[in-house]
Interface confidence: low
């Protein structure tokens, strides 16, 4: 492309006429502000194409860029474009007018921008100011483009002096928009609702100032649209929230609700989904099994736990032997019901330092206006066994007897054993079990009694020994589910002068 005159910058007189010529090997065209002004196009005999742009009665408003380009640039090099800048100094024109859009400069990052205030005369001195300030800012000026630099979120004006008058440009507004990668979170006031109740969902995006929310939901598919509302979260910069509110939910509103957020500056997007269940009426359901017989150990603490699902939130009561329980002021009983997820609950009864009197029939009842469940069990207090007495006697019949008495809950088992070699028993020689054979040398008689008030069993067992010819260590061991206890006695023959 060949441009005459070649430029790249021309200063022309007001009211004059000027001719620009561009020629090339393919059709060429002059462009001004993205438009083609009236021009004369021709093709010479040698195959050269040309276009002549005649500028008549020039004014300051003719100041600006002029481009010559190929009329059909397909298949041609992209640099086949010539730029010419024309100044028409005109004292009647201050700053060249801007489109409204040029007055608002939006930034998404700290970057150099241009405030495009331009004058018609390249000799004029132009200064940049904050709109409210008189001090000129130290920013470089290009008469063809404007002031370029890094600017803060403020409004700016340009000033120049034409003759003896000071001229101000329009105000330019610089805005730094908050934009970041999008991270969406969606939550619901409740993910389970009864029909007739409201569904309310919130979609929140952080760190972006200009976003667009789009919801998809079951009702939308049937053409019944719900208008979401969008707002800033109070006291949180760039936390924007969209709320989708569906009053009086129907069973068909069950399903997946998706919030899609797009950020229009960089065209980022993210979406999150949440499931909503609409139920016909409320429910309470037990989860897991709780045995009908539960145990606690005397003087230890015991927590009894029931897990259930419910909606809406239920009232939970505990009973013992049909009497309502509450947290005791003495701290012996503690009741708590925790919401471990939206519809799942754990109710706990804690007995602190369990007492015998706390055995009995317990019931937990969970209920609301739509449903109820109850769960009952018997609590047994287990008491470790104690050997209360171990004594030896010599009845006149000549045989020797050993009596062992002990208590515990559940019922204790009794084990008798004996050892004849005192020096080696019980470390080296295992004791011999007694009373479980038909041998005549020992006989066993055991009685069991249940003491209602103490809620424990008493075991009394008598061992009859026929022939004791040397000292014998006799041991009584009581065992039950929560422990064992042992005592021993040395039984000596009648003929020996001592007893231990």
């Amino acid at each position: 492309l060949v441009v005459t005159p070649p430029g790249p910058e021309l200063v022309l007189n007001v009211s004059s006429t000027f001719v620009l010529t561009c020629s090339g090997s393919a059709p060429v065209v002059w462009e001004r502000m993205s438009q083609e002004p009236p021009q004369e196009m021709a093709k010479a005999q040698d195959g050269t194409f040309s276009s002549v742009l005649t500028l008549t009665n020039l004014t300051g408003l003719d100041t600006g860029e002029y481009f010559c380009t190929h009329n059909d640039s397909r298949g041609l090099e992209t640099d086949e474009r010539k730029r010419l800048y024309i100044f028409v100094p005109d004292p009647t024109v201050g700053f060249l007018p801007n489109d409204a859009e040029e007055l608002f400069i939006f930034l998404t990052e700290i970057t150099e921008i241009t405030i495009p205030c331009r004058v018609t005369d390249p000799q004029l001195v132009v200064t940049l100011h904050e709109k409210k300030g008189d001090v000129a800012l130290p920013v470089p000026y290009d008469h063809q483009r404007g002031f370029s630099g890094i600017f803060e979120d403020r409004s700016y004006i340009c000033k120049t002096t034409i003759g003896d008058r000071e001229v101000d440009s329009d105000a330019y507004y610089v805005y730094r928009l908050q934009v970041s990668s999008i991270n969406v979170s969606v939550n619901a006031v409740q993910t389970v609702v009864r029909q007739g109740e409201n569904i309310t969902l919130m979609c929140i995006v952080i760190g972006n100032e200009v976003v667009n929310f789009e919801w998809t939901y079951p009702r939308k598919e049937s053409g019944r649209l719900v208008e979401p509302v969008t707002d800033f979260l109070l006291d949180m910069p760039y936390h924007i929230r969209s709320i989708l509110h569906i009053p009086s939910a129907e069973l068909e509103d069950s399903g997946t609700y998706t919030c899609n957020v797009t950020e229009s500056v960089n065209d980022h997007q993210d979406e999150k989904a949440i499931n909503i269940t609409v139920v016909e009426s409320g429910y309470v359901r037990l989860l897991g099994e709780v045995g009908t017989l539960q145990f606690a150990e005397l003087h230890r603490s015991r927590t009894l736990q029931v897990v259930f699902e419910a909606y809406p939130p239920p009232t939970v009561l505990w009973f013992k032997d049909n009497r309502t329980l509450g947290d005791s002021s003495a701290g012996e009983i503690a009741l708590s019901t925790r919401n471990v997820s939206e519809t799942r609950y754990v109710s706990e009864l804690t007995l602190v330092r369990v007492k015998v009197a706390e055995a009995g029939h317990y019931t937990m009842r969970a209920f609301h206006e739509d449903a109820e469940v109850q769960l009952s069990f018997q609590l047994q207090i287990n008491v470790p066994v104690r050997v209360l007495e171990l004594s030896e006697s010599h009845p006149d019949s000549g045989e020797q007897t050993v009596r062992c008495r002990g208590r515990g809950m559940p019922q204790p088992n009794i084990i008798w054993s004996a050892c004849r070699d005192l020096k080696r028993c019980p470390r080296e020689l295992p004791p011999t079990l007694l009373g479980n054979s038909s041998e005549e040398e020992s006989q066993l008689e055991t009685n069991v009694t249940y003491w209602e008030e103490e809620q424990e069993f008493e075991v009394v067992s008598t061992l009859r020994l026929q022939h004791v010819d040397r000292p014998l260590s006799v041991r009584c061991t009581l065992r039950n589910a929560v422990g064992q206890d042992t005592q021993e006695v040395i039984v000596v023959p009648h003929s020996l002068p001592f007893k231990v």
Partner: nanobody, 125 residues
């Protein structure tokens, strides 16, 4: 469809005050909306003046409005107000009320979705 109707314009002496109202209708609630006032002087572009978010009342003003004008809203009446004090002849313009369903646009000085017909304010010297 959202409708906006401005009122309260008129002739006032320089230094005087006016209160413009913008009654919004077409929705039960304007929660989530940004509302704004613009003005257009004869032969000039339409200029942004001030804006407010409906729910929380975030406000934003151009330099020329800051300190002299106050934007507010009454949710119960679905109305937005522009209180204008210390009026100057250069405030003479047609004042337009605008609304946008994206509250996040309250600082964006164009692209509002809904516009009123405008009310004339003339300030004489």
């Amino acid at each position: 469809e959202v409708q906006l109707v401005e009122s309260g314009g008129g002739l006032v002496q320089a230094g005087g005050s006016l209160r413009l109202s913008c009654a919004a209708s077409g929705r039960t609630s304007f929660s989530g909306y940004a509302m704004a006032w613009f003005r257009q002087a004869p032969g000039k572009e339409r200029d942004f003046v001030a804006s407010i978010t409906w729910s929380y009342g975030y406000t934003y003003y151009t330099d020329s409005a800051q300190g002299r004008f106050t934007i507010s809203r009454d949710s119960a009446k679905n109305t937005v107000y522009l209180e204008m004090n210390s009026l100057k002849p250069e405030d003479t313009a047609v004042y337009y009320c605008a609304a946008d369903p994206k509250a996040s646009r309250f600082r964006i000085l164009r692209e509002y979705a809904y516009w009123g017909q405008g009310t004339q304010v003339t300030v004489s010297s």
